[in-house]
């Protein structure tokens, strides 16, 4: 350094704020500088904040020659917080401890104006701004309200409610600094308020808010709602004021999960409704998509099946039905409406699942005019937060008005979420048999709030070998679990695993040592629960209440990507539970009490909540439920007419098309037009149902014109009864069959008989045969056309096959699914049930 340059560097106490500049600032700094400053705070728990003057100019060249560097400590060996050059001033820098090291270096060549920074003690204001709220009502305000809020705040406000209490949060005023160029809601750069469903940064984020748009009323039934308030060191505004109150939730005894969720009423706020695009005149916005809204509806900018209307329900919600209308243009009085649509759901707004019926995307038949309401019920309720309606066909143009029906998980008796999602269950209470990552974060196993999930060390372990465990902290009454798949990069391959558990068992314990499995009340055997069909969409599985502090879930079968799981446990405090009858599915009522909404063909099933009148007598043979994906011993159905052929499982599916997550194989009877035709029988294990009728479900395809027939026969020792028959081409789509197996005092077998006539080309496929414990018997006739008014009984095993010429060589072979048929697996409008929408 030359003699005339003033010295630079030093040790500075930040008790009094001050400035550090490059020598000569704002004139060009000299060459050959090597300045070092140490800035320290007087108290060990204090931090230091540096704010740079925007007039910043240091020779660039990747900061090789001239630069300023800041380290999080008192020497050159401390962690680097930033190394800066060029002409863009660094952002605000805050130390983690009570000291910062700053170094400025210049070489012999080009110079610039240099830098100027202000240092001071970092005053958070946060030490005394965080609060917990437990009283029945209260006010939450930004610090100092109604005055402007302080800088550098990070405050947390947590509202805690007892079980069965709903938290309602209503903002009265709201004004936080925001970027005037901000594109979308939630793009908050400077000051913001985050609202969390649970503990901050653990539970799901409901929304991020800034600017002057007041957040709409929030209703949470998770038991904990948190707000985190962040402010920066610049502009301060008036802040916010909100009222909260707790309301006791007691659903009526006969509660049905078909409550309007709030499109028509406005309970779903405008900010929760969005779309892929909106018509450019601003008169057909997503916010105009409310059922019976009197001002147009939603219309996209261009009509295409890539457009969608989206609703964010904010919290995980059971969706059971969707009602749609078209809209009449105020400007022309012309009507526009959607004739069919697909449904997509997501728990996080990023991972979407197209709703299916069987193997195919379900295409819902919607409106036939612009004003009538058409209600489509889901054949299985969906647990979701985000919903997208994606129009497929329309009249004149897409126009949509909408209502959603359902309920919250917690509306059912003793169904509080016990804390995996919200974070009330701490990480230390979550454990597993093994984990893929060496340093595993137990938070990964949390329902929805985790972006990844739990993966065991061996993704293809033995059934029942791996488990995920939750310690509830104290004994609770446990009544169910919600399971969800998982996603995350594999440490071995760069591919993101999208895994889920297809079947599982649940065990429980009060002490962590003595374990019992949840039993199937019908068989008194360990219950094997149906799991997920997709890595994002969660499924609720309920069971009779058990006392437990520890709950374990054991995967038994899983997706090709292996075991992956996220979890929530449902229940209530040990003293809370009282036996009640639950029905979370919409009810069927007589016609005179129904609302006049035309119905889609699918009747709602009610998950684990339905039961038959006399379940204890149902003894299902092992191997009756069969999806033909596993080796023969797992499936009790036999082929009795010729040699069982297992063809190679060659998939014709596009590997990028995830049409079938796992269930890739099915039985196929095929004929290429040979002279003698085809005939094949598929026979169930023996069934004995002396008292209880049950519902048998299956998937089928039948292609080949008038030459194909598929029938289902009940064969007992002395007689045979035709139960179901289709006698013509059903198209290339997979369809859903349902048949009531009536009670019968003798043992019998179910036989599928497929026929392809002489010289005909065609194929008949069968898959996913199972007894459904979920479907009310009144909904167990599908398609209705397969049930003759009076099918005569036949004896001696002679039935419809008498109409078939001579002998056939049967060829049921195990085949892989093709993704070509993307139609609706249900045929036509087969049912005319009308459903009540009243709870």
């Amino acid at each position: 350094r030359s003699q005339q340059d003033p010295p630079c560097g030093g040790r500075l106490n930040s008790k009094d704020a001050g400035y550090i500049t490059s020598p000569g600032y704002p004139q060009d700094y000299p060459s050959h500088q090597n300045c070092e400053w140490i800035v320290y705070a007087p108290e060990p728990n204090q931090k230091i904040v540096l704010n740079f003057n925007p007039h910043f100019e240091i020779e660039k060249h990747d900061c090789k020659y001239d630069f300023i560097e800041i380290r999080d400590g008192d020497s050159e060996s401390a962690d680097l917080l930033g190394k800066h050059c060029g002409n863009i001033a660094p952002p605000t820098i805050i130390s983690s401890g009570s000291v910062l090291y700053i170094k400025f270096t210049s070489d012999y060549a080009r110079q610039g104006a240099g830098f100027s920074l202000r240092y001071e003690i970092f005053k958070t204001g946060s030490e005394d701004c965080s609060k917990n709220f437990t009283s029945p009502n209260g006010t939450i305000e930004s610090p100092g309200f109604p005055e402007k809020y302080p800088h550098n705040l990070d405050c947390t406000f947590t509202i805690l409610a007892k079980p069965r209490m709903e938290i309602i949060l209503q903002f009265l005023t709201f004004d936080l600094e925001h970027d005037p160029l901000q594109v979308g809601e939630g793009d908050c750069k400077y000051d913001w308020l985050d609202i969390w469903d649970g503990i901050p940064h653990v539970g799901p984020l409901i929304g991020k808010y800034c600017g002057t748009k007041t957040p709409s009323k929030l209703r949470s039934s998770t038991g904990i709602l948190s707000l985190t308030f962040h402010t920066d060191m610049a502009v301060a505004k008036d802040g916010f004021s909100a009222r909260y109150y707790l309301i006791h939730q007691e659903p009526p005894e006969n509660f049905q999960c078909n409550v309007p969720l709030g499109m028509e009423s406005g309970r779903i706020a405008n900010e929760q409704i969005s779309a892929s695009s909106t018509f450019s005149d601003g008169r057909w916005t997503p916010q105009q998509s409310r059922l019976h809204g009197d001002d147009n509806g939603w219309t996209p900018n261009l009509d295409s099946n890539k457009e969608y209307l989206q609703v964010d329900l904010r919290f995980l919600t059971m969706l059971t039905a969707i009602a749609t209308q078209g809209a009449i243009s105020r400007e022309t009085q012309k009507g526009y409406y959607v004739k069919s649509y697909k449904l997509e759901v997501s728990t996080n707004g990023e991972d979407w699942m197209v709703y299916r019926h069987g193997k195919n995307h379900k295409i819902f038949q919607a409106n036939n005019d612009a004003t009538e309401v058409v209600l489509n019920k889901l054949h299985m309720p969906l647990l979701t937060r985000f919903i997208r309606i994606r129009p497929q066909t329309w009249h004149l143009g897409i126009a949509l008005r909408l209502e959603l029906f359902g309920c919250r998980v917690t509306d059912a008796p003793c169904s509080n979420m016990l804390g995996m999602l919200s974070g009330l269950i701490a990480d230390t209470q979550i454990s597993a048999s093994s984990t893929r990552e060496y340093l595993w974060s137990p938070s990964a196993a949390r329902l929805v709030s985790s972006r990844s999930g739990w993966f065991p060390r061996n993704p293809q372990a033995q059934p029942g070998e791996e488990w995920l465990q939750v310690d509830l902290g104290t004994p609770k009454t446990v009544k169910g679990v919600i399971i969800q798949g998982a996603r995350g990069g594999d440490s071995i391959t760069a591919v993101e695993a999208r895994a889920f558990v297809r079947k599982f068992k649940v065990s429980y314990s009060l002490n962590g040592k003595d374990w019992e499995y949840i039993q199937d009340p019908r068989t008194q055997q360990t219950k094997l629960f149906e799991g997920n069909m997709h890595y994002d969409t969660p499924d609720i599985r309920r069971f009779d209440p058990v006392p437990a502090q520890y709950v374990r879930v054991y995967p038994e079968r899983w997706s090709p990507a292996g075991i992956g799981m996220r979890l929530e446990v449902l229940g209530c405090d040990w003293t809370d539970s009282k036996p009640t009858v639950e029905t979370l599915g919409p009810t069927v009522k007589s016609e005179e009490t129904t609302t006049p909404y035309p119905m889609d063909e699918d009747a709602t099933e009610c998950g684990e909540n339905c039961s038959f009148e006399d379940d204890k007598d149902l003894q299902l043979p092992s191997g009756f439920n069969c999806n033909f994906d596993f080796p023969e011993e797992t499936c009790g159905w036999v082929y009795d007419h010729a040699k069982w052929l297992r063809s190679t499982w060659i998939s014709s599916a596009n590997p990028n098309d995830r049409t079938f997550p796992d269930d890739k194989n099915f039985l196929k009877l095929q004929s290429d037009g040979r002279r003698e035709g085809q005939y094949g029988r598929l026979i169930s294990p023996p069934v004995h149902l002396p008292r209880s009728p049950v519902c048998m479900e299956f998937q089928y395809q039948a292609m080949g014109g008038h030459g194909v027939a598929l029938q289902v026969v009940r064969e007992a020792s002395q007689e045979s009864k035709l139960l179901w028959v289709i006698r013509e081409d059903q198209g290339s789509e997979w369809k859903h069959g349902r048949i009531i197996l009536p009670s019968y005092d003798m043992e019998y077998q179910i036989v599928f008989e497929g026929v392809i006539g002489k010289g005909r080309s065609g194929e008949i496929s069968i898959d996913d045969i199972r007894i459904s414990t979920d479907v009310p018997l009144e909904n167990c006739m599908e398609p209705i056309s397969a049930f003759a008014v009076d099918i005569p009984e036949t004896h001696g095993g002679e039935g419809y096959e008498d109409e078939i010429d001579d002998e056939y060589e049967g060829d049921w072979s195990n085949s892989s699914s093709s993704t070509s048929g993307a139609g609706d697996p249900s045929s036509g409008k087969e049912k005319s049930w009308l459903y009540t929408l009243d709870p």
Epitope: F279, D281, S329, E331, T332, Q333, K334, N368, L396
Partner: antibody
């Protein structure tokens, strides 16, 4: 799918014109119908529309003396125009109004003369 | 009001030539515009809707374009049979309008 206007004819000034448009092959519950007229040697002039839900809009000049009604059961739309003058002499068309006027009737000539 | 101004009122074109007809709305009609062809003694025939979509059975020699307030119908490779009067029509708003049609353009083919 078609639309057809009833016969026009000769009318005297101050008379009331009643024309009926009969539709076939589609429903008036799903399509709107507009009335349009064309004076000899002139351009097309819109009179009004009845929407598929029954809402009606008239051109400003026609509002005071025109009435459009429909019968979905009979598949008919009726135009009534009062206080006819010689300026109302024109060919009257009814047209199905979908994404545009995609189906037109052949038209019917109405002459107003004393 | 949404007034439609069509230019020119008349145009001559030789067989094989190209003709361009313009339609201007007094305010944006957001591409809700149709074009019609009318021959003497016949009702109009729809050619183009939504500003640029060809109606079924219409020759691809007819092309519609434009957005906002400015729209164009272009007929290329003109044939004798194209001699007719052409009208534009706004389909955006019928409220408080005198007419939804433009004044018409007569195309004479030589």
């Amino acid at each position: 799918q078609s639309v057809k206007e009833s016969e026009g004819g000769l009318f005297k000034p101050t008379d009331t014109l009643t024309l009926t448009c009969t539709v076939s092959g589609f429903s008036l519950s799903t399509y709107s119908i507009s009335w349009v007229r064309q004076a000899p040697g002139n351009g097309l002039e819109w009179i009004g529309i009845i929407g598929d839900a029954g809402g009606i809009i008239y051109a400003t000049w026609a509002k005071s003396r025109s009435t459009i009604t429909r019968s979905t059961a009979l598949n008919t739309v009726t135009l009534k125009m009062t206080g006819l003058t010689a300026a109302d002499t024109a060919t009257y068309f009814c047209a199905r109004d979908g994404t545009a006027f995609d189906i037109w009737g052949p038209g019917t000539l109405v002459t107003v003369s004393s | 009001a949404y007034d439609m101004t069509q230019t020119p009122a008349s145009v001559e074109v030789v067989v094989g030539g190209t003709v361009t007809i313009k339609c201007q709305a007094s305010q944006s009609i957001y591409s809700k515009l149709g074009w019609y062809q009318q021959k003497p003694g016949q009702p109009p025939k729809l050619l183009i809707y939504r500003a640029s979509t060809l109606a079924s059975g219409v020759s691809s020699r007819f092309k519609g374009s434009g957005s906002g307030t400015e729209y164009t119908l272009t007929i290329s490779g003109v044939q004798c049979d194209d001699a007719a009067t052409y009208y534009c029509q706004q389909d955006y708003s019928y409220i408080n309008v005198d007419n939804i049609f433009g004044g018409g353009t007569e195309v004479v083919v030589k």
